[in-house]
């Protein structure tokens, strides 16, 4: 049905399927050193890995996409691993008069799914 | 900044970058013929195409991902083309006693972005 349960066990082997992974990045990596003061390094959680058939399907559309990819792989791409939710991050950034704190809601992934 | 503008012109040539495309699918294709009565065919809008640097970035996370992919392509995947919004779809589906109408909100893509 349109509400088939997404698969949660990875058929490709450990660490191969869509999951959250931490990537360390400096302000220089991000091109932010001119406007962000702190933190100097960020532990960025990102979504990586493959999306085999029905693995962590985001919704009905992703289930359809997975099925049609199986039937028409040249025409329909497989679902891909993207954030399902985010962790807010506070950055201390430079202003004309000094520094201020600002919270960014869409910077670091908290969970992943296949969309 | 964290709010750099996403690019909207495709540097790869027409039709190569993330966009909405229509795929025709039958109930049999979807594996739904046992529980859906109508429509017998669906015009499914899906998100296809590549996500070159900063093209249609979904949010700050996608911009970071694009940048880090440029620096560490083996470790950080490029953003990928996924739905940004959906068109609801009404299906006439079989019940024990006959048919009923049900609307699905997450079945057909209406817009795409790179996440």
């Amino acid at each position: 049905s349109a509400h088939a349960h997404p698969r949660d066990s990875c058929p490709l082997g450990p660490g191969r399927c869509c999951h959250l992974e931490t990537v360390q990045a400096t302000l220089e990596d991000l091109g932010w050193s001119d406007w962000v003061l702190s933190p100097r390094q960020l532990q960025l959680s990102m979504c990586v890995g493959e999306c085999p058939h029905l693995y962590r399907s985001a919704n009905t559309h992703a289930q359809i996409k997975a099925r049609l990819h199986g039937l028409q792989p040249d025409k329909v791409p497989a679902p891909c691993c993207v954030p399902s939710s985010y962790t807010p991050v506070v950055l201390m950034h430079r202003t004309d008069s000094g520094v201020s704190l600002q919270t960014y809601d869409d910077l670091v992934a908290r969970g992943c799914h296949c969309a | 900044s964290a709010h750099a503008h996403p690019r909207d012109s495709c540097p790869l040539g027409p039709g190569r970058c993330c966009h909405l495309e229509t795929v025709q699918a039958t109930l049999e294709d979807l594996g739904w013929s046992d529980w859906v009565l109508s429509p017998r065919q669906l015009q499914l809008s899906m998100c296809v195409g590549e996500c070159p640097h900063l093209y249609r970035s979904a949010n700050t996370h996608a911009q970071i991902k694009a940048r880090l992919h440029g620096l560490q392509p083996d470790k950080v995947p490029a953003p990928c083309c996924v739905p940004s919004s959906y068109t609801p779809v009404v299906l006439m589906h079989r019940t024990d006693s006959g048919v009923s109408l049900q609307t699905y909100d997450d079945l057909v893509a209406r817009g795409c972005h790179c996440a």
């Epitope: - | 429509p39 068109t87 009404v90």
Partner: antibody, heavy 118, light 107 residues
Framework: QVTLKESGPGILQPSQTLSLTCSFS??????????VGWIRQPSGKGLEWLAN???????YYNSALKSRLTISKDTSNNQVFLKISSVDTADTATYYC??????????WGQGTLVTVSS | DIVMTQSQKFMSTSVGDRVSVTCKAS??????VAWYQQKPGQSPKALIY???YRYSGVPDRFTGSGSGTDFTLTISNVQSEDLAEYFC?????????FGGGTKLEIK
């Protein structure tokens, strides 16, 4: 809960243009597969389909009346409109709008009586 | 245009009886036929979709059958509230067309 309600002028004279409005709730005309149709019924007679409009703005008309009919929609306000030009006494009927899904009419309005009289 | 013919304009039955209302299409319409009930002074109400599928909330004494050109709506164990006119409709092709209706009278 799906509801539809028709409104019209009640009485009009021959050769005038009849303007009908269908206001609905409980569904959206931006939903794939959804449509609204107009059907009329002269007193004591059968049902005659007039026109319909779909979520994607496709429009279909009764071939016998096509030159006189215009259907349109205002999706954001949940309204569908039907205009019938050059009315005659034969257009006297109860006019219904109905939610149309894949060809059939799942829910109907209560109807509005239109009388064409000189 | 496809003509839908309901040859019986009136049918008389008693409470508890079984009655069959028929409808004939002028050409093959597959199973793309619906049935509606219209009680006196009311708007039509959907009963059957795709020739044989009862719409949600419709009592199971209403049954649709047929395909191609011949269709039947059967009401078993007729109740007094079934006093109404019954219409068939084809949606196989435009223009959509209705049958002329069959009025069910309760003795």
């Amino acid at each position: 809960q799906v509801t539809l309600k028709e409104s019209g002028p009640g009485i009009l004279q021959p050769s005038q243009t009849l303007s009908l409005t269908c206001s609905f709730s409980g569904f959206s005309l931006s939903t794939y597969g959804m449509g609204v149709g107009w059907i009329r019924q002269p007193s004591g007679k059968g049902l005659e389909w007039l026109a319909n409009i779909w979520w994607n703005d496709d429009k279909y008309y009764n071939s016998a009346l096509k030159s006189r009919l215009t259907i349109s929609k205002d999706t954001s306000n949940n309204q569908v409109f039907l205009k019938i030009s050059s009315v005659d006494t034969a257009d006297t009927a109860t006019y219904y709008c109905a939610q149309e899904v894949y060809g059939w009419f799942a829910y109907w309005g209560q109807g509005t009586l239109v009388t064409v009289s000189s | 245009d496809i003509v839908m013919t309901q040859s019986q304009k009136f049918m008389s039955t008693s409470v508890g009886d079984r009655v069959s209302v028929t409808c004939k299409a002028s050409q093959n319409v597959g199973t793309n036929v619906a049935w509606y009930q219209q009680k006196p002074g009311q708007s039509p109400k959907a009963l059957i979709y795709s020739a044989s599928y009862r719409y949600s909330g419709v009592p199971d004494r209403f049954t649709g059958s047929g395909s191609g050109t011949d269709f039947t709506l059967t009401i078993s164990n007729v109740q007094s509230e079934d006093l109404a006119e019954y219409f068939c409709q084809q949606y196989n092709s435009y223009p959509l067309t209705f049958g002329g209706g069959t009025k069910l009278e309760i003795k």
